[in-house]
């Protein structure tokens, strides 16, 4: 005997109480595939979530995080508090980046400044809590006789004060 449920399209469920008739999903529920025997409850985007896409009879609601938070995980399963640039989120809240590290976003961790000398370059612009250092030409390129119309200011490693 053919299973009549396989004929039920998305947005409906196969109602065993009514001789396998295809019934529309009740309000606040959906079925995204055909042949379903039940409809799934729609996700509620409340509290720390806000609605990005409303639930329909064939697809679940999609949530975003409210202002001051950002999504984590598949389908925005969690919301994590934003921090300011120059900070990272710890177990005790937002903390400033330690010296020698930076974060240019509202999320994520503080990362070490680029070590320009590893690439044979010098520091053109010092790093800050919010910005990485900018590496410039190698020290050899700045020696007397090097062809440069306007030689850049003396380079310094990050955090070193001028002599």
């Amino acid at each position: 005997l053919q299973d009549l449920c396989s004929n039920c399209p998305a947005g409906t469920f196969c109602d065993n109480n009514r001789s396998q008739i295809c019934s529309p999903c009740p309000p606040n529920s959906f079925s995204s595939a055909g042949g379903q025997r039940t409809c799934d409850i729609c996700r509620q985007c409340k509290g720390v979530f806000k609605t990005r896409k409303e639930c329909s009879s064939t697809s679940n609601a999609e949530c975003d995080c409210i202002s001051g938070y950002h999504c984590l995980g598949a389908e925005c399963s969690m919301c994590e508090q934003d921090c300011k640039q120059g900070q990272e989120l710890t177990k005790k809240g937002c903390k400033d980046c330690c010296f020698g590290t930076f974060n240019d976003q509202k999320r994520g961790i503080c990362r070490p400044w680029t070590n320009c000398s590893l690439d044979g370059k010098s520091v053109l612009v010092n790093g800050t809590k919010e910005r990485d250092v900018v590496c410039g030409p190698s020290p050899a390129d700045l020696s007397p006789g090097a062809s440069s119309a306007t030689p850049p200011a003396p380079a310094r490693e990050p955090g070193h004060s001028p002599q």
Epitope: G47, V48, F49, S77, M78, C79, E80, L89, K91
Partner: nanobody, 117 residues
Framework: QVQLQESGGGLVQPGGSLRLSCAAS????????MTWVRQAPGKGLEWVSS????????IYADSVKGRFTISRDNAKNTLYLQMNNLRPEDTAVYFC??????????SGPGTQVTVSS
């Protein structure tokens, strides 16, 4: 699917008490820190209190310290918030959340608490 269902809200006079409950399902409740947050009319989300997975570590917002008590029953997969000496400024929709004050997920409709004479 993670489900959190809040209940226990209502209308209460200043100085009164309410006990909120949050029934959890769809995840291993005893593995997670749980949190209460609230949203007053026209305001942003405010963290209220958090409790560690085993219940040994508890923290409160200054605004509710000494008046509210968070607790949990891992055998019943339920989170509680006992609210005493309620004030008009406690009027809000209260949500329970899986996670900490900094990283959380809410899925219930919330429960309305109104403090008014």
């Amino acid at each position: 699917q993670v489900q959190l269902q809040e209940s226990g809200g209502g209308l209460v006079q200043p100085g009164g008490s309410l006990r909120l409950s949050c029934a959890a399902s769809g995840f291993t409740f005893s593995d997670h820190t749980m949190t209460w947050v609230r949203q007053a009319p026209g305001k942003g989300l405010e963290w209220v209190s958090s409790i560690s997975s085993g219940g040994s570590r508890i923290i409160y917002a200054d605004s509710v310290k000494g008046r509210f008590t968070i607790s949990r029953d891992n055998a019943k997969n339920t989170l509680y918030l006992q609210m005493n000496n309620l004030r008009p400024e406690d009027t809000a929709v209260y949500f329970c959340a899986r996670g900490t004050r900094y990283k959380m997920s809410t899925s219930g409709p919330g429960t309305q608490v109104t403090v008014s004479s």
